[in-house]
Interface confidence: low
């Protein structure tokens, strides 16, 4: 018999063999980190001679070369030292930033083993346009430099590397890049476990928190979030068994599907577990059409008796028909409940597809995700309701540029990845749903329907009254503390006598709680400039109340994220190494940033925090104040960097009992607070008939309407004090 | 450019049954769905039902639950609506209109398709 | 079942700022469109989702929505403007359309 020669060692590496040296057999290099095999396989051909795949000569000598980095080809308004071609292992590039722009993202990134940087793209940006700079990763060249609403930029790779993310982003409405961003990586490149865990579980938490964002703890529970029964999730677990998996690694894909819905079923939300093996064929092993796949043991029974000798008559990879099995399911439900249902409307759905190689028969995957994405009407605003989670394990036939367009773009997000072999899977999927320390609610989750009380809007929303009138707001933060202002305090009321109104779904004048605790802070002293001529002090205006009980979380009442903390992080969809200064840098990215506050009749209205050089010119018109500050010769003393200002053109002014309330944003349907309302140039409610009424000030007003709230980012030592227990705080 | 093109004019007896066409074209069909709204002369508009390009499923307006029919062929990008039992009050202008999401309204119109009916 | 109202009819002269109402029980808390709809033509979407313009129609053309009531705003209204506007609004999977509000622009 037929037989290949053994001549076939690589320096510096080792080889496996499939099938030992007879025709048929595949050798497969592999070389010490650090260092990737040239060539990476060999195939042991019927005339008994090896095939290199893509070789030129018939047989080339492998060596186990050495891994780089690429190299930036652009770096917009900046420099980056050292220029080199590209970066050995361990190699490190430095960017700084021109004068008038900031640095976003890693100022240095290194070189890994796997052939990746670590870190994240540096950016040069002076905040100019409706979207943040998009940047240029290592390797890429953009085309497109207006950053305005609906204007695009297009991604390539130089050389030989291979695009992963979107080739083509456009800035939305929102300020958000459409897509993923883009990153060229080298063919032989492949991903770490603890870069996947954190990545595939940050965006799976967001798409958990989505199917119904209420959370409570349960401790028996070992402190796992629950998410209260009301949205649905399919999940659709499609498990490659095609020749070139051994029968160990299927073994290692059905575990690590286990570990997944073992995961998901803790989460206590309403799901269903589609589980599809294929090779040449699908084969349906559990339909989200069957009742059973919602119990958890059926599940795993099913898992556990998927035998890879289902596919032995046919060993191709039809990622297509795999695909297309999970449409007919979905097509079969929709009939089922009806299109236009909500019952269908509102399931998520999320597939996971576990591979070592690309499809080989069966026509284009690409045309069933766009069948899927079809009948799910996926699009800009439904884009929550699908995703595509592809995996490819062992770095051998796995094609980076399929897993990429397979895999969900969505901004900050990953849904591509390689991993080195089925060992790396096994632990990707044992800590990608460690929330175990997020013992908190979910926070900032608004509805955001037409229909939606101003409650249900912002359910962070509270009131804070002495005995008789009402006098300021406040900001849940967490199931028993609300942050304030420090003035609603300064008349040293015995905080006994006073309430703290809670939305209550049960009732339109919402819940009262009793303060367990008041925390003002010890810097607040609204005199303590007056022998400078300054009649009124505001900083450090920030207080914290301990409600003397729980608040049961529900859709009119719940926390609002506060940045710096991990609940914000995983709403914000950020990398797990994220620091206080990075949401700095994502939530004030702009010199004018659109952000709200909640008036006296609960309704949200609509600021720009002035930042930058802004900042400086809307501060400035406090100079013109004579009546509050009569000798004023520096700004600074009053408006000091704790605040942050808005009120210039078409700002809406808060009111004298809207104090404390928060400022917030929206970033990926969540709301984030970075303020608190605390002083201003004028009242719109003076003189006006009721609380649904406010006055714009007169455009000739001196001076102009000037609002001064107190920035989050600016206290966190303070809050860090105080919340120690209660948050979970980010590195600053 | 988008267009939705409809079938020409029809005159039909009452009792019988009429099947206009409109046929999609500069978009992706399968991607928006199509509506179908009348307009009695000189009268205002009213929504006939909705069918989903993709799947083929329908939601009819109340009124017509029993006489109509809205279909698609996929292949050809068309779109059709049947309506039977005809009366002289189904004397209209019939329109086609698609639309992305329901709040995104119908953004472009076919020219219409007038039905007499008539003895 | 639901119901839209609209005013039959509302005249002005060139460049004043027409305001078209149309009714319905909380119409605030959904979604409505506007159209336009000029004789022996189709109509033409110009508001949607309360008061978003699509790509082509003039910025004069504003709409708003609370409480009961939508209102479509032409501000410096041309000759051009003259047609019939209806308002449209889902309800249970169910689109309703207004009764229809003829603007006359008078010479």
């Known amino acids: 018999a037929t037989s290949c020669p053994q001549n076939v060692n690589i320096s510096g590496g080792t080889f496996t063999l499939s099938h030992g040296w007879a025709p048929g057999s595949l050798l497969i290099y592999s070389c010490p980190q650090g260092l990737y095999p040239s060539p990476a396989s060999r195939l042991c051909k019927s005339s008994g001679q090896w095939q290199t795949p893509r070789a030129t000569r018939s047989l080339t000598k492998a060596v186990c070369k050495p891994v780089r980095c690429p190299a930036p080809v652009s770096f917009e308004n900046g420099i980056y030292t050292p220029r080199l071609g590209s970066y050995p292992v361990g190699g490190n590039v430095s960017f700084e930033c021109e004068d008038g722009f900031i640095l976003r993202g890693s100022p240095v990134r290194q070189c890994r083993p796997n052939g990746m940087w670590d870190g994240e793209t540096a950016v040069c940006d002076n905040g100019a346009g409706h979207c943040p700079n998009p940047g240029i990763s290592l390797g890429a060249v953009r085309t497109g430099s207006r950053f305005g609403h609906g204007d695009k930029v297009r991604y390539r790779c130089s050389s030989n590397l291979v695009l992963t993310g979107s080739a083509e982003r456009e800035c939305q409405g929102n300020g958000v890049w459409s897509g993923t961003e883009p990153i060229c990586r080298q063919p032989y490149s492949y991903d770490f476990p603890e870069d996947v865990a954190p990545a595939l579980g940050t965006s799976f938490s967001h798409m958990l928190g989505a199917t119904n964002p209420t959370q409570r703890t349960k401790e028996s529970l070992g402190r796992k979030i629950q998410i209260q029964r009301s949205g649905h999730l399919n999940l659709y677990l499609l498990l490659d068994s095609s020749q070139s998996v051994s029968e160990n690694d299927f073994l290692i894909f059905k575990e690590s599907a286990s570990l997944m819905v073992d995961r998901i079923f803790s989460f206590e939300i309403n799901v269903s577990v589609a589980i599809i093996t294929f090779a040449s064929e699908p084969k349906v092993l559990m339909s989200v059409l069957n009742v059973n796949s919602r119990d958890i043991t059926e599940v795993i029974s099913s898992l556990e008796n998927a035998k890879y000798k289902d596919h032995e008559n046919g060993t191709g990879t039809n990622t297509y028909a795999a695909l297309n099995s999970v449409y007919l399911m979905m097509n079969n439900q929709m009939q089922l409940l009806g299109m236009k249902t909500m019952a269908w409307q509102e399931i998520r759905h999320a597939i996971i597809l576990l591979t070592d190689g690309k499809s080989n028969m069966g026509g284009s995957p690409k045309t069933a995700v766009d069948q899927i994405r079809e009948i799910l009407n996926i699009n800009q605003k439904r884009n929550d309701y699908l995703d595509i989670y592809a995996i490819g394990v062992g770095k051998l036939d796995v094609d980076w540029r399929e897993l990429n367009e397979l895999g969900s773009k969505k901004d900050g997000e990953r849904h591509a990845f390689i991993l080195q072999d089925t060992k790396a899977l096994h632990q990707v999927f044992e800590h990608m749903l460690d929330v175990s320390k997020l013992t908190d609610t979910i926070c900032g989750v608004g509805n955001m329907s037409a229909n939606a009380s101003d409650q249900e809007r912002t359910p962070w929303h509270v009131t804070i009254k002495p005995k008789s009138q009402e006098t300021c707001r406040g900001a849940l933060i967490s199931d028993q503390w609300v942050l304030t202002a420090a003035h609603c305090f300064r008349d040293g009321n015995d905080h006994s006598l006073w309430r703290v109104n809670v939305g209550d779904p049960k009732s339109q004048w919402g819940k009262e709680f009793l303060i367990e605790k008041a925390v003002i802070s010890p810097g607040f002293d609204v005199f303590a400039k007056k022998n400078q001529g300054i009649l009124e002090f505001y900083g450090d205006d920030i207080a914290l109340l301990k409600l003397a009980q729980k608040v049961k979380m529900s859709t009119h009442a719940r926390p609002i994220c506060l940045p710096c903390t991990m609940e914000a992080n995983l709403a914000l969809r950020r990398p797990q190494g994220s620091t206080c200064r990075d949401h700095e840098n994502e939530l004030l990215n702009k010199q004018s940033v659109p952000a709200h506050f909640v008036a006296l009749n609960g309704s949200k209205l609509n600021i720009n925090l002035k930042m930058g050089v802004e900042w400086t010119s809307c501060a400035e018109v406090v100079s013109q104040e004579k009546t509050m500050f009569p000798n004023l010769t520096d700004v600074r003393e009053v408006v000091t960097d704790q605040f942050l200002c808005s009120g210039t053109q078409e700002d809406e002014s808060p009111c004298k009992g809207e104090s404390g309330g928060a400022v917030f944003l929206e970033r990926r349907f969540r709301f984030f607070q970075v303020g608190l309302v605390s002083w201003g140039l004028y009242n719109p409610c003076l003189g006006s008939a009721d609380k649904n009424s406010r006055k714009r000030a007169p455009r000739s007003k001196v001076p102009p309407p000037r609002d001064f709230h107190i920035n989050l980012f600016r206290m966190q030592p303070w809050l860090r004090q105080h919340l120690g227990d209660v948050l979970n705080f980010l590195p600053l | 450019q988008v267009q939705l093109v409809q079938s020409g004019a029809e005159v039909k007896k009452p009792g019988a049954s009429v099947k206009v066409s409109c046929k999609a074209s500069g978009y992706s069909f399968t991607t928006y769905y199509m509506y179908w709204v009348r307009q009695a002369p000189g009268q205002g508009l009213e929504w006939m039902g909705i069918?989903?390009?993709?799947?083929?499923?329908?939601t009819y307006a109340q009124k017509f639950q029993d006489r109509v029919t809205m279909t698609r062929d996929a292949s050809t990008t068309t779109v059709y609506m049947e309506l039977s039992s005809l009366r002289s009050e189904d004397t209209a202008v019939y329109y086609c209109?698609?639309?992305?999401?329901?709040?995104?309204?119908?953004?472009?119109w076919g020219q219409g398709t007038l039905v007499t009916v008539s003895s | 079942s639901y119901e839209l109202t609209q005013p039959p009819s509302v005249s002005l002269s060139p460049g004043q700022t027409a305001s078209i109402t149309c009714s319905g029980d909380?119409?605030?808390?959904?979604?409505t469109c506007w159209y336009q709809q000029k004789p022996g033509q189709s109509p033409v979407l110009v508001i949607y989702q309360d008061n978003k313009r699509p790509s082509g129609i003039p910025e004069r053309f504003s709409g708003s929505n609370s409480g009961n009531t939508a209102t479509l705003t032409i501000s410096g209204t041309q000759a051009m403007d003259e047609a019939d506007y209806y308002c449209?609004?889902?309800?249970?999977?169910?689109?309703?359309f207004g009764g229809g509000t003829k603007l006359t622009v008078l010479g």
């Open positions: 449209q609004t889902w309800d249970s999977s169910t689109a309703v």
């Open positions: 069918i989903t390009p993709s799947g083929g499923s329908t």
């Open positions: 909380k119409l605030g808390n959904k979604y």
């Open positions: 209109a698609r639309g992305y999401e329901g709040s995104y309204g119908f953004d472009h």
